[in-house]
Interface confidence: medium
């Protein structure tokens, strides 16, 4: 069996998780991708997914999660902004390939969010003064629902699935404050 590995990210409340998941370009470029959380004793739950087919470098925002799929590079970028303590958990990127089960991309990400002063935008010395503009579109997170003995993914609640972002700007100020720790199970 494939040995599952994790990378541990320890962040403060208010900071941003900014990670990438690599995939095989030829096989999965236009496939729909998803960001899932795996809570202890539960099946994976889909929090956000790209469109179907996945659009190249087109940001999809679901609540505080932003996905960008870079087809030419076989890379899915995942950002979780304004992290909260309750966001702590084990996450993974998967590729939807119906009717087969989702294909998991390594590594899983163990996110630990702790309380603590992370600075205000523009004041944290490790902050980055970048403003990421999300296109003024409404993205519906139409994520498939899989039920199988090994994997079950659930679509996010309706309240977070429809995200309207007219002329919106998301100010991600702490994209550089990522602490990376490899964890081998």
């Amino acid at each position: 069996a494939t040995k599952l590995t994790e990378e541990k990210y320890e962040l403060k409340e208010g900071q941003t998780l900014d990670v990438k998941c690599d995939y095989t370009l030829e096989k999965f470029a236009s496939s729909q991708k998803a960001w899932q959380i795996i809570r202890d004793g539960e099946m994976p739950k889909t929090l956000a997914c790209t469109e179907r087919p996945s659009k190249n470098s087109h940001p999809v925002q679901v609540g505080r999660i932003i996905l960008e799929d870079y087809h030419d590079h076989g890379l899915l970028r995942v950002r979780m902004v304004n992290l909260q303590v309750e966001d702590s958990g084990l996450y993974q990127c998967v590729i939807y390939q119906p009717p087969k089960e989702p294909h998991m991309l390594f590594d899983r990400i163990r996110l630990v969010v702790t309380k603590g002063f992370s600075g205000t935008p523009g004041s944290n010395e490790n902050s980055t003064q970048n403003v990421y503009k999300i296109p003024p579109t409404t993205t519906k997170a139409l994520c498939p629902l899989y039920t199988s003995p090994r994997t079950v993914t659930q679509a996010p609640p309706k309240s977070t699935a429809d995200v309207s972002t007219p002329d919106s700007e998301i100010n991600l100020t702490n994209v550089t404050d990522i602490i990376r720790v490899p964890v081998f199970n």
Partner: antibody, heavy 127, light 107 residues
Framework: QVQLVQSGAEVKKPGSSVKVSCKAS????????ISWVRQAPGQGLEWMGG????????NYAQKFQGRVTIAADEPTSTTYMELRSLRSEDTAVYYC????????????????????WGQGTTVTVSS | DIQMTQSPTSLSASVGDRVTITCRAS??????LAWYQQKPEKAPKSLIH???SLQSGVPSRFSGSGSGTDFTLTISSLQPEDFATYYC?????????FGGGTKVEIK
Amino acid sequence: QVQLVQSGAEVKKPGSSVKVSCKASGGTFNRHAISWVRQAPGQGLEWMGGIIPLFGTANYAQKFQGRVTIAADEPTSTTYMELRSLRSEDTAVYYCASSYFYGSGSSNYYYYGLDVWGQGTTVTVSS
Amino acid sequence: DIQMTQSPTSLSASVGDRVTITCRASQGISSWLAWYQQKPEKAPKSLIHAASSLQSGVPSRFSGSGSGTDFTLTISSLQPEDFATYYCQQYNSYPLTFGGGTKVEIK
């Protein structure tokens, strides 16, 4: 493996600006993060900031925030570092360095060890 | 910012000696540490990343160890071409920061 070639030495007056270029060849430009590091005469290394060309987003050390701009031009595989309001203490050798962030499965980060360096560009600030 | 403290700042050694350089981080950085070698008038050269992984083409006499806050670069048998200045650098969080350097001189 990518190779980095920087522009030539510059002599500047205090208060002026300098723009140093760093051209990448032999690799996939967008699969690297490019950092800029400077070294004053007889001193150690100091990270100024960096850019992920694929995303077009730059990160800066607080010390240089507002005075430095790092940009990337994808068609020419060139990264630029512009430093403004120059003072004598900015006299240094400026290096670009790359971090290869594309992995065959994971590696969920963008910058890490600076594995390839440019040859350096000497910038002298003098009146 | 994470402060990186290297020691010693300089050392004198002979060819064939075993040389150890230490680097201490002001807070835990897991294994996200790199080591560089720099010779006069030259750009730094990457030796080790992830605290202990040797860069391609770097002689096996160089080794790195440590995690958390304390790290070590060891040259098992010093060669004439190893006389240089060595820097550690953390890439655990931004800004990236370097140690002050250790100059290895001929005794």
